[in-house]
């Protein structure tokens, strides 16, 4: 008799793929544009990334540091009208992209939460949640919650409103904290909260702490669904050198949880390469004309257009990983087991029942290394085969689809491998 199939877990839409943050509409669209109508024209691009949700804004009216002139129910006219927003929502729905609205109140000011008027602001947020839920948004984000007094109780209240409207609505909280204990205390008081933090940004410029940070986090959070990013808002290039971007993309897409990216992460957008651009929101490089300030500063391989035409680009890798993440059961909700492989190497298996299984091996070292995969670290349910097929490498030159002997697996400096192998009874 065939073994019984394992019961599938309940999956919410944010469990099925990545979220994509557009915190600054103007920087995202460029060329003096930057409104909701223009964003609607970019939805096809978001579809091509296979992302499941768009985290938008904040776009509400906010006079810097003026609580009276901050209206969470009104869209700043610079971004468009309520009609423009409704139209964006409809278009996004047709493309199966959910829209999450950032309601961080004082986003133009010094303290995101008007620290002296917390109760007034909390009431405004409550009203805004109800208003925008009726308008059809799929969830909310609030950032800088370390600046919000009694954040846990407010988040619990806002979560109740969101979930009370529908279990299919999401609340994301963001914090600049990288302290695991602070993060855990926020999570403990809010069951379904998705939390983005700076936790992984402590992984070091060489990524030396990545493995221990990831495994500690997963051990501490248990079966809880988590999100993976390096910060609540900033680009990957703010924290990582270029040679680690591909490794991190592969890792973020294959860890158990929801990967959260900022616009530009998919092309390695780097403010440092664009003189005069703000670190937190540089202009998106659609093509070489996107940054006319300094002629020749932008080469084709830095842009969406150039990378779209190159199968070996970071953007092509992002698209492939996003596609795999959204359709493979083992990556959608599979179990996770990390095991030893050698210095600088982070290796783990993702598996679900009798579905195809995935082996990820990441070389954070700047040296080529043979992976000594310690299968003895793994439970019987997750044993390694002798060979696995190479689905993709973060570096060019390997023959994809070819079977690799796991005993003889050798990685190039800063190379990551995604391998697949079938379930064997």
């Amino acid at each position: 008799r065939a073994p019984r199939c394992r019961e599938l877990p309940a999956q919410k839409w944010w469990h099925t793929g990545a979220l994509y943050r557009i915190g600054d509409l103007q920087a995202f669209q460029g060329h003096g544009a930057g409104n909701l109508a223009g964003l609607k024209g970019r939805l096809d691009y978001l579809s091509s990334l296979k992302v499941k949700g768009l985290v938008l804004g904040p776009i509400h009216k906010n006079q810097k540091d003026d609580v009276a002139q901050t209206d969470l129910l009104q869209i700043d006219p610079n971004f468009g009208s309520k009609e423009d927003f409704d139209s964006l929502l409809q278009s996004a729905k047709k493309k199966s992209i959910r829209v999450i609205l950032d309601l961080t109140p004082n986003y133009r000011g010094e303290n995101s939460w008007f620290s002296t008027q917390v109760d007034t602001v909390a009431t405004k947020v409550k009203d805004a949640l109800e208003f925008w839920l009726q308008a059809g948004v799929d969830g909310f984000q609030v950032r800088d919650i370390e600046n919000l007094k009694d954040a846990s109780s407010f988040l619990a209240e806002w979560q109740n409103i969101t979930k009370g409207f529908s279990e299919d609505r999401l609340l994301i909280a963001g914090t600049n904290s990288s302290d695991l204990q602070q993060i855990l205390s926020l999570l403990e008081s809010n069951k379904d909260l998705l939390l983005t933090s700076s936790y992984l940004s402590d992984s070091g410029s060489t990524g030396e702490h990545t493995k221990s940070l990831v495994t500690q986090y997963l051990n501490a959070t248990g079966n809880r669904w988590c999100s993976w990013s390096l910060s609540q808002a900033r680009l990957l290039t703010s924290f990582l050198p270029a040679q680690l971007l591909r490794l991190y993309q592969l890792m973020l897409f294959t860890l158990p949880g929801t990967p959260v990216f900022s616009y530009g992460d998919e092309i390695g957008l780097d403010a440092a390469a664009l003189p005069g651009q703000p670190m937190e929101a540089p202009v998106m490089l659609w093509d070489e004309s996107s940054f006319p300030d300094i002629p020749g500063a932008v080469s084709a391989n830095m842009t969406v257009k150039g990378q779209s035409e190159d199968p070996g680009s970071l953007l092509s890798l992002f698209r492939r990983l996003s596609d795999q993440r959204s359709k493979e059961r083992s990556l959608l909700h599979g179990d996770f087991h990390a095991f030893s492989a050698g210095p600088g190497l982070f290796s783990y298996i993702r598996h679900w029942d009798q579905n195809e299984r995935f082996l990820v091996v990441l070389n954070f070292g700047d040296v080529g290394l043979s992976a000594g995969l310690q299968a003895s670290d793994l439970p019987a349910s997750a044993s390694l085969p002798a060979k696995a097929d190479l689905l993709l490498s973060t570096q060019p030159g390997r023959e994809e689809g070819s079977p690799l002997e796991l005993e003889r697996l050798k990685l190039e400096p800063h190379e990551g491998l995604l391998l697949r192998f079938p379930y064997a009874a």
């Epitope: 040679q243 050698g342 210095p343 600088g344 954070f364 700047d366 040296v367 080529g368 050798k410 400096p413």
Partner: antibody, heavy 119, light 113 residues
């Protein structure tokens, strides 16, 4: 300043094992990799293996696989290299050598430990 | 494994003259991703451990005199001592740091003529 101080010279019989220690000071022990390199008198250098003191992950040259074991004691910032089933051609100087995380070149070396294998 | 071949085995140079040591690898040490060559040079004096001079083919380790320079790419590399000093008498080794197992050249003994 960075220092790697190795244990003293050893005389061993063929078939025995030797354990050489390397005490590190002047830097954060777990933030750098430790390598073991050996050198026969008047000869070239031969890399044996590497250990990441933060998690004790190791990688060895195929030639020494199964015969060499690298370990660390983080509490006293000390790395160890044990070589078993000694032969006469293991009569060489053994060095510990530090590398920055993820790098394969060695910026600080111990003073060396001469191991003599003789019946 | 990558094989490293050094030449010459020994070299006698007058004080103040240029000394040139060559090193050849059996495969390219150029990483196409970052365009760096993974080659290091060491100096070893009698009774002492080796001392790092250069890594990534041409990056001088801090504290190393600027008369020492490294060049080359792919499989062919050179260490140059622009003006030999008495304290430079030593054996010099090249090493590939591209891939484990890390391998060394056989060494070049530099003496004063």
């Amino acid at each position: 300043q960075v220092q790697l101080v190795q244990s003293g010279a050893e005389v061993k019989k063929p078939g025995a094992s030797v354990k050489v220690s390397c005490k590190a000071s002047g830097y954060t022990f777990t933030s750098y990799w430790m390598n073991w390199v050996r050198q026969a008198p008047g000869q070239g250098l031969e890399w044996m293996g590497i250990i990441d003191p933060s998690d004790s992950e190791t990688n060895y040259a195929q030639k020494f696989q199964g015969r060499v074991t690298s370990t660390v004691d983080k509490s006293i910032s000390t790395a160890y290299m044990e070589l078993s089933r000694l032969r006469s051609d293991d009569t060489v100087v053994y060095y510990c050598a530090r590398a920055s995380y993820g790098k394969g070149y060695f910026d600080y070396w111990g003073q060396g430990t001469l191991v003599t294998v003789s019946s | 494994d990558i094989v490293m071949t050094q030449s010459p085995d020994s070299l006698a140079v007058s004080l103040g003259e240029r000394a040139t040591i060559n090193c050849k690898s059996s495969q390219s040490l150029l990483n196409n991703i970052n365009q760096k060559n993974y080659l290091a040079w060491y100096q070893q004096k009698p009774g002492q451990p080796p001392k790092l001079l250069i890594y990534f083919a041409s990056t001088r380790e801090s504290g190393v005199p600027d008369r020492f320079s490294g060049s080359g790419s792919g499989t062919d590399f050179t260490l140059t001592i622009s003006s030999l000093q008495a304290e430079d008498v030593a054996v010099y080794f090249c090493q590939q740091h591209y891939s484990s197992p890390f391998t060394f050249g056989g060494g070049t003994k530099v003496e004063i003529k």
